[in-house]
């Protein structure tokens, strides 16, 4: 669709005569008829296939034609066409004398014709005017012409319709050739695809407007390049969505079981050495001078009662010193100046001579000890209870009160709640400090794996086209991560390229 424009500029008829040579009375009141048609090697009469237009009377005899409306006519003259411009044309311009006001062809005598020119040739679409001048024996006509496209039509022959738009069916303006020129932030054949935030992950992110990055299920972060770990994952990471790969020192389905209590909590005090002995359990090896489960208690060197035979112990900066009772000497008052004749054995102890009477030894009754049986037995002195157990004297014997999770005479045994195989359906049992935990196989859940649930959603390989399947364990559903070029909940559809412009 376009317009052939003809601009009449000047008509010269100095003698004021008709084509027949007869003069006009009183002068030649001149108007024009224009016929535009298809190219003819020899321009002949016949239908004006591209259109016709007439002017009102523009002047008398010789005159210049103004560029705007003149006496109700338009200059340039417009000859619109609704077809592809062929690039060639034929043009007939007739100048007529109007004796009266009726300019219809049937109202004029045939000899009212002043002049007739006919041209033909090639004409490309464009803004530039072609200037021409046609001269006959009596008249001269100067004019120019061009072909331009109608609004919204583009291209070499005005055949491409293009309307700028900025809505969800396209964000573009039109180039001179009719091709689309996308507005900033948009791409695609119809400029309907937003350009996402720079760096937005090609598969895991998308956008609905420019410079945006929205994440597909299982992904997060400004550029949607960080996977979302399994819901409840505490001390773990992922490389694909819904994973929970435990950090060092952590275990369990949600990486919430502490396998390295020593490093994470540093429970041992006063420079003690910490050893992991299971989930949330540990043992502290104390430096000399310290005691307690966490080596938190400072140990007096006299606490071990090193002085024998009733000697009293005094703490000193560099150790201890024993004050011996009469009849005894030595670092620990271990040497006696007494013999059995001095009845040195207390609490019913019996005396035995040694070294030909130079020394003696007391054999103590139950519940008494010491070289003179002077001490009541404290069976807890040696701290016999392991794993933080509390030692209790019970008359002639002792007993250990164990911390939760330990048993045995000396609390040396770790209680295994798993020994009775409490996890059903092949579940894996994990001992905890205060009980146990079952890790269930696919298809089972519950504290003891006793509840049958759906199987692994990915087991049936629901994703097509080499897509990666992720099981969302919290919802027993799957998510397909499509490779480039495929879409759909199962990645079953290739991304089809739209057909070319329907111009």
């Amino acid at each position: 669709s376009g317009v052939f424009q003809l601009q009449l500029q000047e008509f010269i008829n100095e003698r004021g005569v008709l084509a027949s040579g007869r003069p006009c009375e009183p002068g030649c009141r001149t108007f024009f008829r224009v016929c535009l048609k298809h190219f003819q090697a020899v321009v002949s009469p016949g239908p004006c296939t591209f259109g016709t237009v007439s002017t009102p009377v523009l002047g008398t005899n010789s005159f210049a034609v103004r560029d705007d409306s003149s006496g109700g006519g338009r200059n340039p003259l417009q000859l619109p066409f609704n077809f592809t411009w062929p690039g060639t044309f034929s043009l007939i311009i007739e100048a007529w004398h109007a004796p009266g006001d009726d300019l219809r062809p049937e109202a004029l005598p045939p000899d009212a014709l002043i002049s007739k020119i006919a041209i033909q040739g090639s004409l490309a679409v464009g803004q530039n005017w072609l200037l021409d001048e046609q001269t006959s024996t009596l008249t001269r006509l100067r004019y120019s012409y061009r072909v331009i496209c109608s609004d919204n039509y583009y291209g070499d022959n005005c055949s491409r319709l293009c309307k700028k738009r900025n809505d969800h069916f396209g964000h573009y303006v039109c180039q001179p050739d009719g091709n689309l020129s996308c507005l900033p932030g948009w791409t695609g054949e119809y400029c309907q695809q937003p350009i996402c935030l720079s760096g937005c992950h090609e598969q895991n992110g998308y956008c609905s407007k420019p410079a945006e990055c929205l994440c597909r299920p299982g992904w997060q972060g400004r550029l949607c390049n960080e996977c979302i770990p399994h819901n409840g994952c505490r001390h773990g990471t992922c490389s694909t969505p819904w994973q929970c790969t435990c950090d060092e020192g952590w275990g369990g389905l949600f990486c919430d079981q502490d396998l390295n209590y020593c490093t994470h909590h540093s429970p041992c005090k006063n420079g003690a050495t910490c050893s992991n002995s299971g989930q949330r359990s540990y043992t502290c090896t104390c430096r000399p001078g310290y005691t307690g489960v966490d080596c938190e208690l400072e140990l007096s060197e006299c606490d071990s009662n090193p002085c024998r035979n009733g000697g009293s112990c005094k703490d000193q900066e560099d150790g201890y010193h024993c004050l011996c009772p009469p009849g005894y000497y030595g670092l620990h008052c271990e040497h006696s100046t007494l013999s059995c004749a001095d009845s040195p054995c207390f609490n019913g102890g019996s005396c035995r001579e040694r070294n030909q009477g130079a020394n003696y030894a007391c054999e103590c009754p139950p519940n008494f000890t010491g070289s003179n049986c002077e001490k009541k037995v404290d069976r807890c002195t040696s701290n016999p209870c392991a794993n933080g157990g509390q030692c209790l004297n019970r008359g002639p014997s002792r007993m250990c009160r164990c911390r939760p999770g330990f048993t045995g005479t000396y609390c040396e045994l770790h209680v295994s709640d798993c020994a009775r195989n409490p996890c059903a359906h092949g579940g894996t049992c994990h001992d905890l400090e205060n009980g146990l935990m079952c890790t269930c196989p696919a298809g089972f859940s519950g504290r003891r794996c006793e509840v049958r649930t759906s199987i692994d959603a990915c087991a049936s390989s629901p994703c097509f086209n080499r897509a990666t399947c992720y099981t969302d364990l919290s919802t027993d559903t799957f998510v397909c991560n499509c490779p480039y070029g495929f879409v759909g909940s199962r990645c079953e559809f290739p991304v089809g390229l739209p057909p070319s412009f329907p111009w």
Epitope: D151, L161, D167, H168, G488, E492, G496, P498, P502
Partner: antibody, heavy 121, light 104 residues
Framework: EVQLQESGPGLVKPSETLSLTCTVS??????????WGWIRQPPGKGLEWIGD???????YYNPSLKSRVTISVDTSKNQFSLKLSSVTAADTAVYYC?????????????WGQGTLVTVSS | SYELTQPPSVSVSPGQTASITCSGE??????VSWYQQKPGQSPVLVIY???ERPSGIPERFSGSNSGDTATLTISGTQAMDEADYYC?????????FGSGTKVT
């Protein structure tokens, strides 16, 4: 060839919410070349565009209905849905779902057969 | 809000040409679609982007659009063309339908 099918209750009480679903078969809803729209036609009257949605979830609504309309998409089920709240008798109409083609300048090249929704107590 | 105006009805004899107009401010700068709707049926797209025909639509349907008026022309009208016809355009992000024209 793509086909669209509307489903939902045919009778809704005044002040309640009208809910319809359009199921797309014979083609994927996951395409940037289409928008998925809802159009309604009161008995004996003309067509009124309600709104549309892309597969990514971008929505566009008729300004006169915007405060009451919600359109959503479920790509895994190849469905999109319409919710119209606080309905009155004036919302009684045949509701159509349609595919609007970017390559057709937004023209609706495929329509459902329509479902009549009556608002009455 | 943007409005598209159509004549309520157009009568035409079989074999003659029917012209249906659709007017709206600056409509020539928008793409216009035309839909045919027969009683009890869903609308069918007959013209898109002013003058393009979808596959399966007869050549007797043509369209044009300039200025403030778009026109759907049915040349050599047949009895089966009796229906309601709606024009449609996009204003900003919203779809707008014309009031509809009954062709008998």
């Amino acid at each position: 060839e793509v086909q669209l099918q509307e489903s939902g209750p045919g009778l809704v009480k005044p002040s309640e919410t009208l809910s319809l679903t359009c199921t797309v078969s014979g083609g994927s809803i996951n395409s940037g070349n289409y928008y998925w729209g809802w159009i309604r036609q009161p008995p004996g009257k003309g067509l009124e565009w309600i709104g549309d949605i892309s597969y990514t979830g971008s929505t566009y609504y008729n300004p006169s209905l915007k405060s009451r309309v919600t359109i959503s998409v479920d790509t895994s089920k190849n469905q999109f849905s319409l919710k119209l709240s606080s309905v009155t008798a004036a919302d009684t109409a045949v509701y159509y779902c349609a595919r609007e083609d970017v390559m057709y300048g937004g023209g609706g090249d495929s329509w459902g057969q329509g479902t009549l929704v009556t608002v009455s107590s | 809000s943007y409005e598209l105006t159509q004549p309520p009805s157009v009568s035409v004899s079989p074999g003659q040409t029917a012209s249906i107009t659709c007017s709206g401010e600056g409509l020539g700068d928008k793409y216009v679609s035309w839909y045919q709707q027969k009683p009890g049926q869903s609308p069918v797209l007959v013209i898109y982007e002013d003058s393009e025909r979808p596959s399966g639509i007869p050549e007797r349907f043509s369209g044009s659009n300039s200025g403030d008026t778009a026109t759907l022309t049915i040349s050599g009208t047949q009895a089966m063309d009796e229906a309601d016809y709606y024009c449609q355009a996009w204003d900003s992000e919203a779809g707008v339908f014309g009031s509809g024209t009954k062709v008998t």
